[in-house]
């Protein structure tokens, strides 16, 4: 007896962050000898949709023309072949940003920081939040999360980055979320341009010296210094 | 040129309703901005009634006097707000404005108000 | 909830003057703190915004100051076209707030 259908691969164009209005594609991804494609939402009934194959049969395409909050969550999808149904894909966690308004990113004592020393990113929004997330741009893995404890709601939270290197220079945005849905942020914050300046103790590396060795804020999560100023808010990375 | 104008008000009875209308222009109600409503009876001070979110959820607060005699909407298609009074009071008599929270968290724009009295 | 005190409620001043009006946060709300000058019969207008920062178009005889829960507006040298009432108010929304400004303070002549 054959095994298990290999499970499906699950994906968004034009990503899996979209903001509100803007379209969004979701391709699954079977083997050609699909006769049917499901999309299933958590915490919807399924299936969520279905779609015939498009020529030649190993994918098909669900269309979102006008992104909205009921559309963010979190998706599988499956293909039917004439041997039956296929594992699920993994997840696709598709977000949606512009559901509050925008907070604000400070960095203190300034964004101009010397290598070595400490500087924390502040992300703060007029109304009370319960998740912060600090992006990087262009970073391999870009989310820090300051996630609230027992739905206690804070207007802020406190990005500790010590000691600073050079790559930890670069843009930043943060977003805040409710307590609705994770899967719904806010408008992107104004971005920060954090430059970092060598010091006598820890000379800025030549444009030709690698830096890649030493592992940066692209590459791992940033450990706090101390705790977490606002008690209720508890650190996650993803 | 950027303005919020509001129109709706006038007499009313005590226990009426009205529906104050606040239209933007020049900016779009569902950029990320907060917009409140604000009122002033004659010779007093300003007094904030509640606020609404212009990201998509459309969150609303309110001050803790409000109890749920107010509500704020809004109309994005027609990049306007909305303040639905009802069970009015005299002691709601006021001019109301509605103002924009700027990026630097303060309200950098207001309306020219509107006038409501209640009496009988 | 956060309370605005605002003091004096009225003060009386002549052109020249310096004048300095206070308000007071029962919490700390960091920076996030706007002056407003009101004239009779017309729209408040945004002074002082984040504390300390003049809006656009405000001449630079008014300055503000302070963080956390003390602030103070400051005009240098008072001019007849600054006789009005100022508010304060903290930029913070949430459902626990009974006002998120400070009860004024009238500025007549001497």
């Known amino acids: 007896q054959a095994g298990p259908l290999p499970k499906p691969t699950l994906w968004a164009e034009p990503g899996s962050v979209i903001s509100w209005g803007n379209s969004v594609t979701i391709w699954c991804q079977g083997t050609l000898e699909a006769r049917e494609y499901r999309l299933d939402k958590e915490e919807s009934p399924a299936p969520w949709d279905r779609q015939n194959p498009l020529e030649p049969k190993n994918k098909a395409r669900f269309s979102i023309p006008s992104m909205t909050e009921d559309y963010a969550g979190r998706y599988r999808c499956y293909y039917r072949s004439p041997v039956g149904w296929s594992q699920p894909s993994d997840p696709l966690e598709l977000v949606m940003t512009g559901a509050y308004s925008k907070p604000t990113l400070s960095a203190l004592p300034s964004p101009l920081v010397t290598s070595g020393k400490s500087v924390t990113l502040l992300c703060q929004s007029r109304s009370p939040m319960d998740t912060f997330l600090l992006i990087k741009e262009r970073a391999a893995h870009p989310l820090l999360h300051l996630r609230s404890e027992h739905g206690a709601q804070q207007h802020q939270a406190e990005f500790p980055m010590s000691p600073v290197t050079s790559v930890h220079g670069g843009t930043y945005r943060c977003f805040s979320s409710h307590g609705f849905s994770h899967y719904l942020l806010s408008h992107p914050s104004d971005p920060l341009e954090l430059i970092v300046s060598g010091s006598l103790e820890d000379p800025r590396p030549s444009p030709t010296r690698s830096v890649s060795t030493a592992a940066g804020p692209e590459d791992q999560p940033l450990m706090p210094t101390g705790s977490v100023p606002h008690s209720g808010l508890r650190r996650h990375w993803e | 040129e950027v303005q919020l104008v509001e129109s709706g008000g006038g007499l009313v009875q005590p226990g009426g309703s009205l529906r104050l209308s606040c239209a933007a222009s020049?900016?779009?109600?569902?950029?990320?901005?907060?917009i409140s409503w604000v009122r002033q009876a004659p010779g007093k001070g300003l007094e904030w009634i509640g606020s609404?979110?212009?990201?998509?959820?459309?969150?609303?607060y309110y001050a803790t006097w409000v109890k749920g005699r107010f509500t704020i909407s809004r109309d994005n298609s027609k990049n306007t707000l909305y303040l639905q009074m009802n069970s009015l009071r005299a002691e709601d008599t006021a001019v109301y404005y509605c103002?924009?929270?700027?990026?630097?968290?303060?309200?950098?724009?207001w309306g020219q108000g509107t006038l409501v009295t209640v009496s009988s | 909830d956060i309370q605005m005190t605002q003091s004096p409620s009225t003060l009386s001043a002549s052109v020249g003057d310096r004048v300095t009006i206070t308000c007071q946060a029962s919490?700390?709300?960091?920076?996030?703190l706007a002056w407003y000058q009101q004239k009779p019969g017309k729209a408040p207008k945004l002074l002082i915004y984040?504390?300390?920062t003049l809006a656009s178009g405000v001449p630079s005889r008014f300055s503000g100051s302070g963080s956390g829960t003390e602030f103070t507006l400051t005009i240098s040298s008072l001019q007849p076209d600054d006789f009005a009432t100022y508010y304060c108010?903290?930029?913070?929304?949430?459902?626990?707030?009974?006002?998120?400004f400070g009860g004024g303070t009238k500025v007549e002549i001497k």
């Open positions: 103002a924009r929270h700027g990026d630097n968290w303060a309200l950098d724009l």
């Open positions: 020049g900016f779009s109600l569902s950029s990320s901005y907060w």
């Open positions: 609404i979110d212009s990201g998509s959820v459309g969150i609303t």
């Open positions: 919490q700390s709300i960091n920076s996030w």
């Open positions: 984040k504390a300390s």
């Open positions: 108010q903290h930029g913070y929304i949430r459902g626990d707030l009974d006002n998120v």
